[in-house]
């Protein structure tokens, strides 16, 4: 799978959306590696 | 609302080295990777590289590793791409663009900086 | 390097009509593409992510489809604001590419 940092970006703000943003304060795309996903 | 502002344009001599900045505003600057891309008159795009504000990370395109240094001044919100041993072929506009998720999903760009390298 | 290719480079088109710009990949890439649109002096401005997904507040007349090599942005009815040039980017692999962009003129 993608792990640049824009795949990862967007893979993140799906995550987002579909938890309704329901998420750790910390979730952010330069907080997380490519193993989150 | 979301504003990247980057610097004035510059004009350089042939073998000098140019620090161009992005100021971010409007969201968590160390969320987000920051871009830098170049467009040199009737070219196409051109990515030199991201930077992770959080960590100093960076990922560089191999045609410009060795000349160009992404770097960060967290406490300012604002990214600087330095572009070094400066050549004609680097005259081009150079923006930053960043996606950004929170408040508002969408890819930002700065408004350009215009280097001209001229002896 | 993965080289992406857009075609035409230019076209002529009138308002309302339909029009559809390709991209093709030198390798995979997924659906890890991106559609830009720029004006003469201006910053580009984001149209799609994800091959095919909407950023907010584009209009719904732009669409782009495509998975692996082959993408397109398609315009269902141009407008007189959409005159401009596109480009495709590809984010699956360092260096991130872009195409060498479709220039949309008015007929």
């Known amino acids: 799978s993608c792990n640049t940092a824009t795949c990862v970006t967007h893979r993140l703000a799906g995550l987002l959306s579909r938890s309704g943003g329901v998420v750790k304060d910390n979730f952010v795309p330069t907080n997380v590696g490519s193993e989150a996903f | 609302e979301v504003q990247l502002v980057q610097s004035g344009a510059e004009v350089k001599k042939p073998g000098a080295s140019v620090k161009v900045s992005c100021k971010a505003s409007?969201?968590?600057?160390?969320?987000?990777?920051m871009n830098w891309v170049r467009q040199a008159p009737g070219q196409r795009l051109e990515w030199i590289g991201d930077?992770?504000?959080?960590?100093?990370?960076?990922n560089y395109n191999q045609k410009f590793k060795g000349r160009a240094t992404l770097t960060v001044d967290k406490s300012a919100s604002t990214a600087y791409m330095e572009l070094s041993s400066l050549r004609s072929e680097d005259t081009a506009v150079y923006y930053c663009?960043?996606?950004?998720?929170?408040?508002?999903?969408?890819?930002?760009w700065g408004q350009g900086t215009t280097v001209t390298v001229s002896s | 390097d993965i080289q992406m290719t857009q075609s035409p480079s230019s076209l002529s088109a009138s308002v309302g009509d339909r029009v559809t710009i390709t991209c093709k990949a030198s390798?995979?890439?997924?659906?890890?593409v991106a559609w830009f649109q720029q004006k003469p002096g201006k910053s580009p401005k984001a149209l799609i992510y994800?091959?095919?997904y909407r950023y907010s507040g584009v209009p719904s007349r732009f669409s782009g489809s495509g998975s692996g090599t082959d993408f397109t942005l398609t315009i269902s009815s141009l407008q007189p604001e959409d005159f401009a040039t596109y480009y495709c980017?590809?984010?699956?692999?360092?260096?991130?590419?872009f195409g060498g962009g479709t220039k949309v003129e008015i007929k």
């Open positions: 663009a960043s996606i950004i998720i929170v408040p508002n999903y969408f890819d930002y």
């Open positions: 409007g969201y968590t600057f160390t969320d987000y990777y």
């Open positions: 930077i992770n504000p959080n960590t100093g990370g960076t």
């Open positions: 390798q995979n890439v997924d659906t890890n």
């Open positions: 994800s091959a095919s």
């Open positions: 980017q590809q984010y699956n692999n360092y260096p991130y590419t």
